[in-house]
Interface confidence: medium
Amino acid sequence: VEVQVSEDPVVALVDTDATLRCSFSPEPGFSLRQLNLIWQLTDTKQLVHSFTEGRDQGSAYANRTALFPDLLVQGNASLRLQRVRVTDEGSYTCFVSIQDFDSAAVSLQVAAPYSKPSMTLEPNKDLRPGDMVTITCSSYQGYPEAEVFWKDGQGLPLTGNVTTSQMANERGLFDVHSVLRVVLGANGTYSCLVRNPVLQQDAHGSVTITGQPMTF
């Protein structure tokens, strides 16, 4: 028996359902009583789901997995993972044994889009050209860790005094805070771009300082 899985990682958004595809080619006369199917975490060997002795043995993984029972006899051994969490990320191995044995691993990449950044300025009044200001760009509830870029009004990178911190919350999602310390020009726009590297999603925020007043 030959087991096939998708070579590319399966990308799933947090809180959505993911299908880890796995298939085999049953021989003529194949019966589900002959099938032993195991899904497990590749690294820890923890059992996720199994089908053996002619029946679905059920989920051994937080009761959030399911097979496609009607499709098993056609060789579809895919696994449905419900309400994906950050902690589900990793490699899953699909083992199929009829008389032969084969296995293959599929990677699950979890992702969550970052919120539109909020911008804060400190100090935020009585600003004059030449003043040192701190601009903070905050974006929330994303995964995996973000890439943060700062640009000026002409779209040129601001690589100076930037400090970025990313903290995971209890769900494993990241809140990003990036601080730019910059000397004000006569007027200017400061843009923050928070990029999710998996989703290739860019979230933009900007602040424009034109003497008085400021616009966000």
Epitope: E27, I38, Q40, K45, E53, T93, S97, Q99
Partner: antibody, heavy 121, light 107 residues
Framework: QVQLVESGAEVKKPGSSVKVSCKAS????????ISWVRQAPGQGLEWMGR????????NYAQKFQGRVTITADKSTSTAYMELSSLRSEDTAVYYC??????????????WGQGTLITVSS | DIQMTQSPSTLSASVGDRLTITCRAS??????LAWYQQKPGKAPKLLIY???YLQTGVPSRFSGSGSGTEFTLTITSLQPDDFASYYC?????????FGGGTKVEIK
Amino acid sequence: QVQLVESGAEVKKPGSSVKVSCKASGGTFSSYAISWVRQAPGQGLEWMGRIIPILGIANYAQKFQGRVTITADKSTSTAYMELSSLRSEDTAVYYCANGGDSSSWYTFDYWGQGTLITVSS
Amino acid sequence: DIQMTQSPSTLSASVGDRLTITCRASQNINSWLAWYQQKPGKAPKLLIYKASYLQTGVPSRFSGSGSGTEFTLTITSLQPDDFASYYCQQYDSNPLTFGGGTKVEIK
């Protein structure tokens, strides 16, 4: 390279039970089936049953049903075969065997060294 | 249970001989047949699986053929190391069953 090391030879009285252990190393113990095969002196090979440690599910040859229990301890990568109500015809070498990481649950690339169980009054 | 019948039960041969051992299944087992070699006091060694596939590390003088109910193990040029017992095993269905064995001895 999978290695299977069995416990030592034992002499048992008829009607008693014996428990043979099989410790695996060098492979992915929990995912693969461990079978027990016995061989009476001068006789052929006889499959008794198997366990898939990750599932904790064992199945047995009808001949031994109710008399044999196969278990596995994933934490120590050890499989066990317990045979009860022993009789003289159970005198045999008992082997544990498996197909290794890349083979079958039904053919045996790797074998233990064998454990001789002698049943005698 | 599927019965496996091996013949002959004993075979006398000389180094360099070509040997054929036959295994018959009591019902169709497709190609789900393995062959093992066993030497006295040792565990069996897998030679052939799925009727004709040579296990890694097994010399090419060993070959297997057949499907359905009739299978053969052939040793093209017998070597001193080949004097042993040989067993077939079906794995089409539970319980797995072995043939009674063929002992290859020196003529």
